[in-house]
Amino acid sequence: MGRARDAILDALENLTAEELKKFKLKLLSVPLREGYGRIPRGALLSMDALDLTDKLVSFYLETYGAELTANVLRDMGLQEMAGQLQAATHQGSGAAPAGIQAPPQSAAKPGLHFIDQHRAALIARVTNVEWLLDALYGKVLTDEQYQAVRAEPTNPSKMRKLFSFTPAWNWTCKDLLLQALRESQSYLVEDLERS
């Protein structure tokens, strides 16, 4: 873990101010894989290379984030830089020989729950928010909190509102949200788990 992130940061830090601006504009229109959301324009345009790297990794995870960055660089005519990024990402990431178990690709920060670990990606990518709310209502969410989340206009704003309540939750409350995510958007949990 971290190799792809470092390679993305390296590439973005080597862009001129004008190139970085162009990169961000292209990122707003680049085709995305199904299930991935777009980084909001307002937040994106004000970011420096470091913030943008963090945002790319939290939205798209390391592997796809690096691939997407390379695609945008290629689209900008920066083929050599795109090639270097992909080479750095793939270096040392070959498959384990048959019969040998590769260790998990990453270890989450100890003591950090899955939903805290993947907060940004969950805000961006959870679509079935109403289902989550129904699953959590009465167990984790009060009626007032339930209504406050439902009142938000978009899925990301609903999730952001839901996350505003999580600092008061204990581990088991967070587990109930994770369980609801497993049941409603299992593919997303799998995807984040691989990151």
Epitope: P104, G111, L112, Q117, W171, L178
Partner: antibody, heavy 122, light 107 residues
């Protein structure tokens, strides 16, 4: 090396109280959930619940809620399972276990204690 | 609660045989299933997690597959050390539940 060492076998009478322990070493105790399972003679494994020592919160199988209590002592990296009033049906082998890792896949139990046999008989 | 049903309950086989144990979930559990091996007087040992991932140190003759409600554990060529009881476990939702076990015995 991750190790979970459980307390020894117990023979008790119905109505008595009991607290069995699971001493953890090899990782930071407060970073992971500790789960408890039991196996009654001739039966399959059953999940009792878990405790998260980081904040002391516990999740129970509803079947065991009110029957047994999970706790943890951070100062000595030890998790406990206790009963205030044992029944003959509590006779079983009890295991503590730690998940493979602490985030989404904490449902897979890679590390187990050796088991504590509890016999309740008059 | 999600019920896990294993079949067969007992399986007689010989060293070198290919054996398959199945596990049926009473509702969709996606890929959130693991397999354990248990020998008398010992703690269970994790073999497979998330349906098909081989746990570190487990011989490659063990493999897992399936998603949704139907899962299988396959041992490609039985070794003397493999005679034991095998359990599946779902991790989709609480309470976590195990199958009743499949006892693999020498024919």
């Amino acid at each position: 090396e991750v190790q979970l060492v459980q307390s020894g076998a117990e023979v008790k009478k119905p109505g008595e109280s009991l607290k069995i322990s699971c001493k953890i070493s090899g990782y930071t105790f407060t970073d992971q959930t500790i789960h408890w399972m039991h196996q009654m003679p001739g039966k399959g494994l059953e999940w009792i619940g878990y405790i998260y020592p980081g904040d002391g919160s516990a999740m129970y199988n509803e079947k065991f809620r009110g029957q047994a209590t999970l706790s943890a002592d951070k100062s000595i990296s030890t998790a406990y399972l206790q009963w205030s009033s044992l029944k003959a049906s509590d006779t079983a082998m009890y295991f503590c276990a730690r998940p493979l890792y602490s985030y989404a896949s904490y449902y897979w139990f890679a590390y187990w204690g050796q088991g504590t046999l509890v016999t309740v008989s008059s | 609660d999600i019920q896990m049903t294993q079949s067969p309950s007992t399986l007689s086989a010989s060293v070198g045989d290919r054996v398959t144990i199945t596990c049926h979930a009473s509702q969709n559990i996606n890929v959130w299933l693991s397999w354990y091996q248990r020998k008398p007087g010992k703690a269970p040992k994790l073999l497979i997690y998330k349906s098909s991932n081989l746990h570190t140190g487990v011989p490659s003759r063990f493999s897992g597959s399936g998603s949704g409600t139907e899962f299988t554990l396959t041992i490609s060529s039985l070794q003397p050390d493999d005679f034991a009881t095998y359990y599946c476990q779902q991790g989709q939702s609480y309470p976590l539940t195990f199958g009743q076990g499949t006892k693999l015995e020498i024919k």
